[in-house]
């Protein structure tokens, strides 16, 4: 959670002299309450906007907008405190609008905006606008709060921001997974334009369960430059387990900008549909009997196998 370094934020507008100051999130009116305090903000709105830094990097920002209520309390309005709380880390950042002149009229509705809080992909924030001075301890609250959920890097506009690109958002592996004979999966995906290794993580599940019945990890060495953007094909051997039929294939890249924390892509193969009507009993005897007591779950000594090649 940080403030955009460029351009300098502005809160002055026609009819109001104002400056933006950093704030400790603890306005003096908390400690020294005033008798007369303004009413709360009206129509607080938070939207996702995007802004460039001086270095040319693109970041998501919270665009905060609110209006004043059309009452006489604007005569006592000395400014506003804007506070952004990141829910998962409890980090809070505040700025203060300090009014250097008095608001005297409501010829038009007063509207304020601020777009300098840089936010992170896939994070949740509580945005609060407090009118200043803050109310006496038992006074009516004069703040408004709203939650703001920032989309993750799958979002079209987010994809091209610097934090998302750093985590590999521009790579689209276009994964395809097909089931082959003899308990095998063929995984195909497009390599990125970086000489870095990949990992394929295969997790298999029974039809309606979330506890895995088979896991396998396959390492793909770094491609050569002539293999960039080519398809890589990998054949994974599955465990021959009855009912262990839903397969999740996850591809983890290790790009230099994100190392072991890059965005992963996955594809899932569902279990084959069960026929609605029972199958007719065959008029021949099977060549084997199902082994009684056989386990549908993985044994540590029974590993899957795989092989791969890059396709040009």
């Amino acid at each position: 959670l940080r403030l955009l370094d460029f351009p300098a934020p502005v809160c002055a507008q026609e009819g109001l002299s104002c400056r933006v100051k950093n704030s400790t999130c603890l306005d003096d009116s908390w400690i020294h309450p005033r008798n007369l305090t303004p009413s709360s903000p009206k129509d607080l709105q938070i939207q996702l906007h995007f802004a460039h830094t001086q270095q040319g990097d693109l970041f998501p920002v919270a665009h905060i907008e609110w209006t004043l209520q059309t009452d006489a309390s604007i005569l006592y309005l000395e400014g506003a405190e804007l506070s952004v709380l990141q829910l998962n880390t409890n980090e809070r950042l505040c700025v203060r609008f300090e009014f250097l002149s008095k608001l005297r009229h409501h010829h038009r509705r007063w509207r304020f905006t601020f777009s300098h809080f840089v936010v992170d992909p896939d994070q949740e924030y509580e945005v609060t606008v407090h009118h200043l001075p803050k109310p006496i301890p038992d006074g009516d609250p004069n703040h408004q709060s709203k939650n703001f959920l920032v989309p993750d890097c799958e979002h079209a506009r987010m994809k091209v921001t610097t934090p998302c690109m750093s985590s590999g958002s521009l790579w689209d592996p276009n994964i395809t997974v097909e089931t082959l004979e003899a308990h095998q999966l063929r995984v195909s995906f497009t390599l990125w334009n970086e000489s870095t290794h990949y990992q394929i993580l295969l997790t298999s599940f029974p039809h309606m369960e979330n506890h895995s019945c088979f896991e396998h990890m396959h390492h793909i060495p770094a491609p050569r430059p002539e293999e960039f953007h080519q398809r890589s094909n990998v054949t994974l051997t599955l465990r021959n387990l009855k009912g262990c039929c839903r397969h999740q294939v996850q591809i983890q890249p290790f790009f230099s900008s994100c190392l072991n924390d890059c965005l992963r892509h996955s594809a899932t193969v569902s279990c084959p549909e069960m026929p609605d009507t029972p199958e007719p009993i065959p008029d021949y005897m099977p060549l084997w009997e199902p082994r009684s007591g056989s386990s549908d779950y993985k044994d540590d000594d029974d590993k899957g196998s795989s092989h791969h090649h890059h396709h040009h």
């Epitope: 829910l87 998962n88 880390t89 409890n90 994070q123 709060s145 924390d261 992963r264």
Partner: antibody, heavy 118, light 107 residues
Framework: EVQLVESGGGSVQPGGSLRLSCAAS????????MNWVRQAPGKGLEWVSI????????HYADSVKGRFTISRDNAKNSLYLQMNSLRDEDTAVYYC???????????WGQGTTVTVSS | DIQMTQSPSSLSASVGDRVTITCRAS??????LAWYQQKPGKFPELLIY???TLQSGVPSRFSGSGSGTDFTLTISSLQPEDVATYYC?????????FGPGTKVDIK
Amino acid sequence: EVQLVESGGGSVQPGGSLRLSCAASGFTFSSYSMNWVRQAPGKGLEWVSIISSRSSIIHYADSVKGRFTISRDNAKNSLYLQMNSLRDEDTAVYYCARPKVGGGMDVWGQGTTVTVSS
Amino acid sequence: DIQMTQSPSSLSASVGDRVTITCRASQGISNYLAWYQQKPGKFPELLIYAASTLQSGVPSRFSGSGSGTDFTLTISSLQPEDVATYYCQKYNRAPFTFGPGTKVDIK
């Protein structure tokens, strides 16, 4: 001294209700999100719910969604958990916990015990 | 929802041993991971946050590492007072799920 003190636990029949409270002191309560975490006898920790500092963000674990309601009163430095339609599996020690700036929960109450049994 | 797993579920080690506990997230959670120690009959205590930052007051024999999906808590030299259950917790986004715990005792 930073302190959280839970109260309101007790025994209740399945389908019944209880309201837990957590009294905070020694810090600016209104600046922090707050959590409830529970622990069934002999089991691990289970995160239950979070409420942001101004109550505009609330989340629940799937296991309690629709039955539990988290709330707070910043003027009273208090956090609450209203528990309805209680089930046997809600039997646990319930802790309120304050998040640390940067992540994790660094201040915990001593816990209050809820027993759901017929 | 993201699942958290821990291994081993329990371990016994001698005083002075190096102990390693691993925590795995089913999807990447960046470094949004905390470790807690809970002694029998007590409330949990925060040991590590942001995957590798030691909470103030926690002995330096505790350390954390990892990012993305795989995380490790290491006790460099196990002490008798370290007998406890250790939990990881992810906090990238709600729900802030805990791992199932690893019980550590002395041989």
